[in-house]
């Protein structure tokens, strides 16, 4: 499977849209900053077989999609930008799904390292809990937007490393 240039373009567009979604200055939200403990080691990509990396990347996309497609999220962001963001995420998830079918050798490889997947899920659970505790305030959403941008850039780097392996 070739995580093509198109996929790379999608990644850049996703990050660009996240940047455009910003509604308030991060500096006005410094008191709301929070360490969500992003599981960075799961995106190092060295310990991964390709199938497992694909799986972790998809988890990241799906959880991001889930987070930003809630009612509370729809109220917090510009609808047009949000829809464009969904489209990019959806396209990337489709590409990754197709990769599992196309990838030679994936059949023999376990599709997941359960610890990695659970680490990503727990990371998003921490984000969801934070938003609930902060009652979905504009500053809380801004902190989360910045956090997701950071984590998506780790995903992008992992994808670049996978492409170099191709």
């Amino acid at each position: 499977c070739n995580l093509s240039q198109t996929h790379s373009l999608n990644n850049r567009r996703t990050l660009m849209l996240m940047a455009q979604m910003r509604r308030i200055s991060p500096f006005s939200c410094l008191k709301d900053r929070h360490d969500f403990e992003f599981p960075q080691e799961e995106f190092d990509g060295n310990q991964f077989q390709k199938a497992q990396a694909i799986s972790v990347l998809h988890e990241m996309m799906q959880q991001t999609f889930n987070l930003f497609s809630t009612k509370n999220s729809s109220a917090a962001w510009d609808e047009t930008l949000l829809e464009k963001f969904y489209i990019e995420l959806f396209q990337q998830m489709n590409d990754l799904e197709a990769c599992v079918i196309q990838e030679v050798g994936v059949e023999e490889t376990p599709l997941m390292n359960e610890d990695s997947i659970l680490a990503v899920k727990k990371y998003f659970q921490r984000i969801t809990l934070y938003l609930m505790e902060k009652k979905y305030s504009p500053c809380a959403w801004e902190v989360v937007r910045a956090e997701i941008m950071r984590s998506l850039s780790f995903s992008t780097n992992l994808q670049k490393r996978l492409r170099r392996k191709d």
Partner: antibody, heavy 126, light 110 residues
Framework: EVQLLESGAEVKRPGSSVRVSCRAS????????ISWVRQAPGQGLEWMGR????????NYAQNFRGRITITADKSPLTAYLELSSLRFEDTAVYYC???????????????????WGQGSLVTVSS | EIVLTQSPGTLSLSPGEGATLSCRAS???????LTWYQQKPGQSPRLLIY???SRATGVPDRFSGGGSGTDFTLTISRLEPEDFAVFYC???????????FGQGTKVEIK
């Protein structure tokens, strides 16, 4: 846990259309597709199509293209199946089905149906 | 388009016996995208096995899935009275997304 509740049984004339609804409740996400699957009396299961409610993106099985329309509302999360130009052989139980957000890894989630509605019987009869 | 053929059509067995159900694909299917369901009369289907071999929540360990390429199996090690039903295999292919079901295998009490 997701609950899917479908609309009641319908009797339709050949050539007419039917609209079946499926309301989702519980741990629902508009970021997961909802599919329609039908089962003719004494027969097997047949996938008809799906919709991603967050985007309204649809995919239809080849057999139904031109006769099928799937739509959705995001709040409350509800999917609709409309089938036109009904024939006798469209008599079936129509199920809505969705993945589970708890399936790990999520890449497998959209490839299967973890939750099913109770089914809605559509009878085509003259 | 992928065609899934299940065999046998009907399997007549007694409680306590083992059962092996076959699902053959007309072309290669990713085992990760192969799913099994159980359906009892008058009920909706129930997810049993996904990803080729992972049991869904609440599914007893007497059910197991295996196989790769074009040949897949569902094995029930010891049939319990509540296991008698119709079993369907289902594959997924993308893009575009297509879900295909086998015609089903009925496991009935002998």
């Amino acid at each position: 846990e997701v609950q899917l509740l479908e609309s009641g049984a319908e009797v339709k004339r050949p050539g007419s259309s039917v609209r079946v609804s499926c309301r989702a409740s519980g741990d629902t996400f508009s970021s997961y597709p909802i599919s329609w699957v039908r089962q003719a009396p004494g027969q097997g299961l047949e996938w008809m199509g799906r919709i991603l409610p967050a985007l309204g993106v649809t995919n239809y099985a080849q057999n139904f293209r031109g006769r099928i329309t799937i739509t959705a509302d995001k709040s409350p999360l509800t999917a609709y199946l409309e089938l036109s130009s009904l024939r006798f052989e469209d008599t079936a139980v129509y199920y809505c089905a969705s993945p589970s957000a708890d399936i790990i890894p999520s890449i497998l989630g959209t490839t299967l149906f973890a939750f099913w509605g109770q089914g809605s019987l559509v009878t085509v009869s003259s | 388009e992928i065609v899934l053929t299940q065999s046998p059509g009907t399997l007549s067995l007694s409680p306590g016996e083992g059962a092996t159900l076959s699902c053959r694909a007309s072309q290669n299917v990713s085992r990760h995208y192969l799913t099994w369901y159980q359906q009892k009369p008058g009920q909706s289907p129930r997810l049993l096995i996904y990803g080729g071999s992972s049991r869904a929540t609440g599914v007893p360990d007497r059910f197991s899935g295996g196989g790769s390429g074009t040949d897949f199996t569902l094995t029930i090690s010891r049939l319990e009275p509540e296991d008698f039903a119709v079993f369907y295999c289902q594959s997924y292919h993308s893009p575009p997304p297509v879900y295909t079901f086998g015609q089903g295998t009925k496991v009935e009490i002998k």
